[in-house]
Amino acid sequence: VLPAKPENISCIFYYEENFTCTWSPEKEASYTWYKVKRTYSYGYKSDICSTDNSTRGNHASCSFLPPTITNPDNYTIQVEAQNADGIMKSDITYWNLDAIMKIEPPEIFSVKSVLGIKRMLQIKWIRPVLAPHSSTLKYTLRFRTINSAYWMEVNFTKEDIDRDETYNLTELQAFTEYVMTLRCAPAESMFWSGWSQEKVGTTEEEAPYGLDLWRVLKPAMVDGRRPVQLMWKKATGAPVLEKALGYNIWYFPENNTNLTETVNTTNQTHELYLGGKTYWVYVVSYNSLGESPVATLRIPALNEKTFQCIEAMQACLTQDQLVVEWQSSAPEVDTWMVEWFPDVDSEPSSFSWESVSQARNWTIQKDELKPLWCYNISVYPVLRDRVGQPYSTQAYVQEGIPSAGPVTQADSIGVKTVTITWKEIPKSKRNGFIKNYTIFYQAEDGKEFSKTVNSNILQYRLESLTRRTSYSLQVMASTNAGGTNGTKINFKTLSISHHHHHHHHHH
């Protein structure tokens, strides 16, 4: 049977290296060899390229080598497949070398900021040695901040045949490290070079970008003063490398600026002790180049009624994220503050917060939270300078079985009944939401019974036991991940009730 007609011919001109064509089918059922017929020098000349029919038969690729590679030029390519039964020819295909030329990548030799020009990096590179001299080259410059995985791209062309070329990349973030890589191609070509080796550069530092400011209001002290824990961080979008030398805080009661107090600190948190009135708090960060814009916060009066607009909230897990969504009765509220911290018996060591705008959901990567830890998540509505009532929920990013089961004891042992009491497992050992408890009990040499109760029940009365019988019992606490048994306890039912026993003594 004749070989299949060669199709899907694709050719590429590796500048000053070779002209290579590939085709399909790549494999034939019977032994097949190929001849590639070419015309070049604009059709004036004609030659062939053969796949070696001893070692490289069935190899659907062939390369023409210098010195017969001329540029610019138009080629025609036709592939002939031959086996013992005969020859099958492809259609004739036409190739303009300028359109299929692939050159070496350029070499970036510097990425530097230019003194006095903000938010710009100047990239200098060497045009590839193996590139046609007269040709206009098009370039793609890829860049990203050093800690990002997302590349941005800019395209441009260069007509000059300078060996040393430059491009000014503008509208960058201040004081940020960028990774750059560059590729090029002749202007008419469909094939790009590979990417150059990556090079890193840093934009010039500026005055700080700005701050996000939040607070935790604590209960008033005996003397009437209110502790307010202020906290701030670089605003979303601020340069990663930005360093503040310090922070200036000033605050005063509403309508009374002559009672302004100021604080200077190098920390990103500060506790204020305020009176019962409404206060205004302002914070700026500064470095050697200047101050950031002012971050402002209104602390409500002690007796102020706060608005409530969040009606419901759900936390759900996707493959790699925790998503919290809420419903609001106030369409005008479009800013929210989310707080999250571990629900532990002691004072939380890590407290986090983040502003959300133009959305009613908040997402966090699962790996930013600890598995097996319960997190308290609160969402505050923010309408201009007013902060509303929070709505709170709890979530685990990953549940496990409890680290310990419930500590159990048997009370009120009777002839046929017993009351079992157990303690809640400490928060640090739950590893998930306790769904239910299961009581397993078994008479000596008897069948095991079990009873499952809701997680809010910590006591249960077992009935229909056998008198004067030894029982073993344990309580299992279960999360979505499974259950853990508590310590095993033993008890023996009475032969007669205490009530009858006492009566008998009286006689």
């Epitope: 020098s41 604009y42 004036y44």
Partner: antibody, heavy 118, light 112 residues
Framework: EVQLVESGGGLVQPGRSMKLSCAAL????????MAWVRQAPTKGLEWVAS????????YYRDSVKGRFTISRDNAKNTLYLQMDSLRSEDTATYYC???????????WGQGVMVTVSS | QFTLTQPKSVSGSLRSTITIPCERN????????VSWYQQHLGRPPIIVIY?????PSEVSDRFSGSIDSSSNSASLTITNLQMDDEADYFC???????????FGGGTKLTVL
């Protein structure tokens, strides 16, 4: 419509020179290799010379090398053949031809007669 | 360097089929494309086959070209011979040694 029109032929004495011209019409002249092919009376076709698109590369049959010069003026869409030291065996009809894209001469002029005789 | 050899003449009766061979004496016939030209008396040649077996759109489909590697020759076949087919036919190929085209000696076709 592609047209090739030769001119400049005639009678010339051995050892003298003659220049043939070929005006090209109806196609982008600068995109094609061009050739001169001759045919002696009652004989077959014989390639004489060819020239690349920009004129940088020229090709000749051995018997005319050093005596004939092929050239082109892309601005004027014209092909030339300068023939020096002419011999009687150069007597032939000279055709101007276009090299097509696939190793063939796809268009030919009407031909011009060159007679080398004393 | 190679030569292309054609028979001096071939004849065929009206509406019959003839084949004109063109044999390459040195190197493989398939190493470069073969073209065929028709030349009526006193007229310039016109191309009838290029790239071994390709026919220009304006040429009758009675004309076909082929390559036979076993005899190292190309062939021009004309079916259903017409009186107007009476002409000289030349094969041509590219020779990389001389960096130029090589023509066969030509075949005179007579239609009886």
């Amino acid at each position: 419509e592609v047209q090739l029109v030769e001119s400049g032929g005639g009678l010339v004495q051995p050892g003298r020179s003659m220049k043939l011209s070929c005006a090209a019409l109806g196609f982008t002249f600068s995109n094609y290799y061009m050739a001169w092919v001759r045919q002696a009376p009652t004989k077959g076709l014989e390639w004489v010379a060819s020239i690349s698109t920009g004129g940088g590369n020229t090709y000749y049959r051995d018997s005319v090398k050093g005596r004939f010069t092929i050239s082109r003026d892309n601005a004027k869409n014209t092909l030339y053949l300068q023939m020096d030291s002419l011999r009687s065996e150069d007597t032939a009809t000279y055709y101007c031809a276009r090299h097509g894209t696939i190793a063939a001469m796809d268009y030919w002029g009407q031909g011009v007669m060159v007679t080398v005789s004393s | 360097q190679f030569t292309l050899t054609q028979p001096k003449s071939v004849s065929g009766s009206l509406r019959s089929t003839i084949t004109i061979p063109c044999e390459r004496n040195n190197g493989d016939i398939g190493d470069s494309y073969v073209s065929w030209y028709q030349q009526h008396l006193g007229r310039p040649p016109i191309i009838v086959i290029y790239a071994d077996d390709q026919r220009p759109s304006e040429v009758s489909d009675r004309f076909s070209g082929s390559i036979d590697s076993s005899s190292n020759s190309a062939s021009l076949t004309i079916t259903n011979l017409q009186m107007d087919d009476e002409a000289d036919y030349f094969c041509q190929s590219y020779d990389s040694n001389i960096d130029g085209p090589v023509f066969g000696g030509g075949t005179k076709l007579t239609v009886l």
